[in-house]
């Protein structure tokens, strides 16, 4: 029972985590304009991995995609790659773990096969979570570096005649979503790996083999060796766990005939 619960919970936690990683990757608020120096701005800038957006005084939000590949910073490309790898690994992990779930019967699949699949999906979830955490952390580090660089530029080299306030960017909501989602995927992966240990067959009975020694009529039967993983019992109780993640996008402006790009 405990193994099924651990496996099911691991699956659900990973599912929520991967949905979060996908949401974070798609979100536009990876970096948002720091309003500390300009709290009264009517034009609010924020940026994602794929496009940058500007919310204007009319409430209209204009987003423009990064239509260049070579012109983008290497760090941004690296973050994109990490997030995509995380999503791909997570998606494959989910697919594998569905078939590995103890509560789902697929033909005559042995417990040892399910254990292997559970371990595989667990490792995939762990790597997926690490990719997401790494991607978000690299971006956050990039933001911190740029923030202090622009702060230094703001107060030097202008001879006191500061007319243009340089836009500084701070952490956006997507970073926090990414960190939490990566953490959840990682935890889910660890839970799957733990469940795997309990899924391995509890007993391996070896068939008795007769050894006939010449001149002796003695049969030697080796005793049954008990193989134990030490983690929980292999129960037949079936429990279905359901889980999901839902994200809401509150960007309230949609292109209309009055919008100019």
């Amino acid at each position: 029972m405990a193994v099924t619960a651990c496996q099911g919970l691991g699956f659900v936690v990973s599912l929520i985590g991967i949905a979060g990683i996908i949401a974070a990757t798609c979100m536009d608020q990876w970096s948002t304009q720091d309003l500390y120096n300009n709290p009264v701005t009517a034009v609010f800038n924020y940026q994602g991995l794929w496009r940058s957006c500007v919310r204007e005084s009319s409430g209209f939000t204009e987003c423009r995609g990064y239509f260049t590949l070579l012109g983008l910073p290497a760090m941004l490309q690296a973050v994109r790659a990490l997030m995509i790898v995380g999503i791909v690994l997570g998606a494959i992990g989910l697919l594998v773990s569905i078939f590995a779930l103890k509560c789902i019967r697929i033909g005559s699949m042995e417990d040892s096969a399910k254990a292997n699949m559970t371990l595989t999906s667990g490792i995939m979830f762990i790597v997926s979570g690490l990719c997401a955490i790494a991607g978000v952390s690299v971006f956050a580090n990039m933001l911190v570096t740029n923030f202090w660089m622009s702060t230094a530029n703001m107060y030097t080299g202008m001879g006191g005649m500061v007319q243009t306030v340089q836009t500084r960017y701070t952490f956006g909501a997507a970073l926090f979503v990414g960190w939490v989602a990566g953490g959840l995927t990682l935890i889910g992966g660890v839970m799957m790996c733990i469940a795997c240990r309990g899924l391995a067959p509890e007993e391996t009975n070896y068939k008795a083999v007769s050894y006939h020694a010449s001149g002796h009529s003695v049969a030697y039967k080796p005793g049954g060796f008990k193989a134990s993983t030490g983690f929980g019992s292999n129960t037949k109780n079936k429990k279905i766990y359901d889980g999901g993640a839902r994200t809401e996008d509150e960007v309230q402006s949609y292109p209309s005939k009055h919008d100019y790009v």
Epitope: Q33, N38, V40, T41, A42, V43, N45, Q47, S52, V54, E56, S57, S58, G59, F60, E62, R64, Q163, T164, V165, Q166, T167, Q252, S253, Y254, S256, H258, D259, Y260
Partner: antibody, heavy 115, light 113 residues
Framework: QVQLVQSGAEVKKPGASVKVSCKAS????????VHWVKQAPGQGLEWIGY????????KYNEKFKGKATLTRDTSTSTVYMELSSLRSEDTAVYYC????????WGQGTLVTVSS | DIVMTQSPDSLAVSLGERATISCKSS????????????LTWYQQKPGQAPKLLIY???TRESGVPDRFSGSGSGTDFTLTISSVQAEDVAVYFC?????????FGGGTKVEIK
């Protein structure tokens, strides 16, 4: 087509309040902020503030805080501006404006404060 | 608050002549996020509401005659009417659309000589 239709002219006594309405049509009401601007006779334009019809969020010019209150009714796509404690210097034409770059303005509402 | 200073206060030009209106802001109106200057020009005819002419300092609103053009960046902006027509008699306002409170220039009255 897009229209912002304001309520008619008002004549009020000093100390009274007035509520001016602005009905929007021809576009998705919750997609754009509705701003208000004051134009005193023969004078320039002064920004009063805006309301976000999507979530009722408001922002005011410091000068008009306590003087103007913006509200909205999404069911009728109407925004209201209430001016309190009227004085003679509040006599002006008040405009509501919306859409990108304020491409559309109401026809204006003349509020006259006279004893 | 950003102060918008328009000059001249009034301008009398002959039909077909060029009219130039200047607008200066006390702070830059250039948004680094999209490299656009958030300065807007409006035309107000007597007894009417202002009408949008130019946004982003130089982009003409659809339906506005091409004799109207805007230029400038940062803090200095110009509205030019290349060949003034009788229907261009109006007051022209520039507006800071970059920072709250949104502020307007004092206006420039264009008349025919």
């Amino acid at each position: 087509q897009v229209q912002l239709v304001q309520s008619g002219a008002e004549v009020k006594k000093p100390g009274a309040s007035v509520k001016v309405s602005c009905k929007a049509s021809g576009y998705t009401f919750t997609n754009y902020f509705v701003h208000w601007v004051k134009q005193a006779p023969g004078q320039g334009l002064e920004w009063i503030g805006y309301i976000n019809p999507y979530n009722d969020d408001t922002k005011y010019n410091e000068k008009f805080k306590g003087k103007a209150t913006l509200t909205r009714d999404t069911s009728t796509s109407t925004v209201y501006m209430e001016l309190s404690s009227l004085r003679s210097e509040d006599t002006a034409v008040y405009y509501c404006l919306s859409l990108r770059f304020f491409a559309y303005w109401g026809q204006g509402t003349l509020v006259t404060v006279s004893s | 608050d950003i102060v918008m200073t328009q000059s001249p206060d009034s301008l009398a030009v002959s039909l077909g002549e060029r009219a130039t209106i200047s607008c200066k802001s006390s702070q830059s109106l250039l948004n680094s996020g999209n490299q656009k200057n958030y300065l807007t020009w409006y035309q107000q005819k007597p007894g009417q509401a202002p009408k949008l002419l130019i946004y982003w300092a130089s982009t003409r609103e659809s339906g506005v005659p091409d004799r109207f053009s805007g230029s400038g960046s940062g803090t200095d902006f110009t509205l030019t009417i290349s060949s003034v027509q009788a229907e261009d008699v109006a007051v022209y306002f520039c507006q800071n659309d970059y920072s709250y409170p949104l502020t307007f220039g004092g206006g420039t009255k264009v008349e025919i000589k």
